[in-house]
Interface confidence: low
């Protein structure tokens, strides 16, 4: 049962796993719901009543039966963690906290204008977890205007006390607002040999490296594959890291695997939802429960379904046996991850599922496409709206992109003479324009943003947010797309298609069937070449073939790029403007994503 | 560059209300300050309300009657003034600052003001 609401003047009883230091008590139910076992939490506030020392104390705890004895007492808050519900959860916390000090390791000391820089700073700091600034007012004259970057083991402070004048507050790399390159590689037959801060067994490198990925001071790590010499470390997963950020040290060694924490660009990778199975593989771990189960996907679904499950061994039935249903092992551990890994003995192990919502929606696995051919096919392009105005007739305007459940991206452009939202209709889940009738359910758009410093489409800044009036519950044909990560500006992109209902020549008319073309992308200096008359900024980039051919085109206009990099979909760019369509040597120009990323997320996660 | 627009000033009777809005443009995030100020004739421009990362400051003269709030998505700070009073006749400015204020929390340390927008509470 999910229980979002904080029980004031409560304390649980008992059950107690550990306890950390945060500022809020809303933090602290965040802190549960990403701690591996944590199903219940008590915190205390600051208060006349409790002895200061146990001011801001988190106390994660479990139990069996989901709940716990409630008992009475001054400035305790309790809850419940968000294990237990259905909705996205997110560890992003923009809070500042007036006159905190938030103890850890200060590991970095300078001087910065507000606080507001002391976070970006810290937000751009490979080790920072959260800071703490010294503001104009502090009373000791030399550490005004500090900016103190501090780190602790767990990522929570060590402590936290009163403290006047200052202000302090947490690292926004989990909101995919860090600067940080997002190194993807995994590196086969590599050893780095930094300092472990810890260990955990994992069936392979990619489970390894999402670990490392949320493990807060692990920065890039090792993993033995179950060929590996050492017996007793085989499946080994080492989370590492070191003072430069850097492995300072690399072996080359057969059957091991390293590679980085992708942290800075997690909200365009699963980290946390680890889908695959694992065939002839058992994992070992405490026993929660033993159930008769069909397969491996139901053994896996009952995992998902019941909460302390963290994964499970299912062992397929022996001919004719128990109606031909195996046993599900469903287990769990301290940490998350199986105890022992073993091969050879028939099991298919995996993990539950329940921790996929806490990554972005965007990451998950669409359809596969169908290659060849113009016309898309039903469920191919989820992300893909068709935005219509009423006025004077009802028609399509322009494409977007659902990039979140109440928000869709497009081109500014797109709102030439729109003088008000209430005339404009956004059509999800749409393969043809023939199926929109009269009472076709639409989203209707609460607010247009359009970036301020956009004049016309060729001087860039073509990019606009719808806000819808109510929220997209996604589905098979209606999903985000992943906006490409800042770190990720290096990226070449190779697998990119553009998609619309728009003209297929430059004299035609609006297509019925989503159009769809791959389409490559083309450098700023050679896209430069072909619009001697245009500037193409670092804000907009390019994509077609030399000889012409396929295009975007009138109607397609703030519809995606959409290009498919380790098997995620990431909106790279906008349709923005070009000289025709799809003639020799004038590629389409399009909004360049990335280098709006920030704009987006000030707009849409502004409270 | 920055702009802060004032609306909502206008002629009231004693007792009465009104509500002032600031909206900010052409700064991406929000402020770490923002303030309303007030300039009556012939005297010198005097602290009213503050808002300072969340937490907010009252002249004085105007605390429980003045209530300053801010929306950050909108970069917009709002002035509610109720059971006004004839001393509360002047032109109020918005200010916005991206720094800390200075050790007063009225020190005129902010980087950008509005036009201003008259307020006349007659008797």
């Known amino acids: 049962e999910c229980v979002t609401q904080l029980l004031k003047d409560t304390c649980f009883e008992g059950g107690d796993i550990t306890t950390v230091f945060t500022p809020s008590a809303k933090y602290c139910q965040v802190v549960c719901t990403y701690h591996p076992r944590c199903l219940l939490f008590t915190f205390t506030a600051e208060s006349p009543s409790e002895d200061p020392t146990r001011w801001f104390t988190c106390v994660l705890k479990d139990s069996v039966t989901e709940t716990l004895p409630r008992v009475n007492r001054t400035a305790a808050i309790s809850g419940y963690s968000f294990k237990q519900c259905s909705h996205q959860i997110s560890a992003c916390n923009k809070d500042i906290y007036v006159d905190l000090d938030m103890k850890g390791i200060n590991y970095n000391s300078s001087v910065a204008k507000s606080a507001q820089e002391c976070q970006e700073r810290c937000t751009d700091d490979v080790h920072c977890h959260f800071f703490t600034y010294a503001t104009r007012q502090f009373p000791s004259l030399e550490h005004r205007n500090i900016c103190l970057l501090k780190h602790t083991q767990t990522g929570t402070p060590t402590r936290i006390t009163k403290l006047d004048k200052v202000v302090s507050g947490f690292s926004l790399k989990s909101c995919a607002l860090s600067n940080l390159a997002c190194i993807r590689d995994i590196f086969p037959n590599t050893v780095f040999a930094d300092s472990n801060i810890d260990s955990v067994m994992a069936p392979d490198a990619f489970v390894c490296g999402r670990i490392c990925t949320h493990h807060p001071g692990c920065l890039f790590f090792t993993f033995f594959s179950q060929e590996w010499p050492k017996e007793s470390q085989r499946n080994l997963c080492l989370l590492k890291t070191s003072e430069s950020g850097l492995p300072s040290t690399r072996i080359k060694k057969s059957k091991a695997l390293s590679g980085f924490s992708l942290q800075s660009c997690r909200h365009s990778i699963p980290v946390f939802c680890h889908s695959s199975f694992y065939h002839d593989t058992d994992f070992l771990g405490e026993e929660l429960d033993i159930v008769a189960a069909k397969s491996h996907e139901a053994c896996q679904k009952l995992c998902t379904n019941a909460v302390r499950c963290q994964f499970f061994t299912y062992t397929p039935a022996q001919a004719s046996c128990n109606e031909g249903k195996g046993k599900c092992y469903l287990k769990l551990s301290s940490n998350g991850s199986p105890t022992k890994i073993l091969h050879g003995r028939g099991g298919i192990s995996g993990y539950t599922l329940r921790l996929c919502k806490m990554d972005n929606e965007c990451t998950t696995k669409i359809k596969p496409r169908i290659v060849g051919g113009t016309a898309s096919v039903r469920g191919e392009w989820p992300w893909q709206v068709t935005l219509h105005t009423t006025s004077p007739t009802q028609r399509h305007l322009c494409g977007g992109s659902i990039i979140g459940n109440q928000w869709i991206l497009t081109a500014a452009h797109c709102f030439y003479g729109v003088e008000s939202p209430k005339i404009l209709r956004v059509y999800s889940g749409i393969l043809n324009q023939s199926e929109i009738k009269e009472d076709t359910s639409f989203f209707g758009v609460q607010e247009i943003i359009i970036h301020d410093q956009y004049k016309m489409a060729e001087s860039g800044y073509d990019i606009a947010l719808l806000k819808l009036e109510t929220t997209v519950n996604y589905t098979d044909s209606q999903r985000p797309i992943c906006l490409p990560s800042k770190g990720d500006r290096n990226v070449i992109y190779t697998d990119c298609w553009v998609t619309g209902w728009g003209y297929r020549k430059l004299r035609d008319k609006i297509q019925n069937t989503l159009q769809k073309a791959k389409i490559p992308l083309v450098t700023n200096e050679e896209c430069q070449k072909r619009y001697r008359g245009h500037k193409i900024t670092h804000k907009m980039i390019c994509a077609g073939y030399r000889e012409g051919g396929k295009d975007a085109c009138k109607g397609d206009s703030g519809g995606p790029l959409s290009c498919k990099h380790n098997e995620v979909w990431h909106l790279v760019g906008i349709t923005s403007w070009g000289e025709g369509c799809a003639q020799r040597e004038r590629p389409g120009v399009y909004t360049n994503v990335v280098e709006y990323v920030d704009w987006i997320l000030e707009k849409t996660q502004a409270v | 560059q920055v702009q802060l627009v004032e609306s909502g000033g206008g002629s009231v009777q004693a007792g009465g209300s009104l509500r002032l809005s600031c909206a900010a443009s052409g700064y991406t995030y929000s402020f770490n300050s923002m303030g309303w100020f007030r300039q009556a004739p012939g005297k010198e421009r005097e602290g009213v309300a503050v808002?300072?990362?969340?937490?907010?400051h009252y002249a004085d003269s105007v605390k429980g009657r003045f209530t300053i709030s801010q929306d950050n998505s909108k970069n917009t700070v709002y002035l509610q003034m109720n059971s006004l009073r004839a001393e509360d006749t002047a032109v109020y400015y918005c200010?916005?600052?991206?720094?800390?204020?200075?050790?007063?929390?009225?020190?005129?340390?902010?980087?950008?003001w509005g036009q201003g927008t008259l307020v006349t509470v007659s008797s």
């Open positions: 808002i300072y990362l969340g937490s907010t």
């Open positions: 200010a916005a600052d991206l720094l800390e204020y200075d050790g007063t929390w009225f020190g005129s340390t902010y980087n950008y």
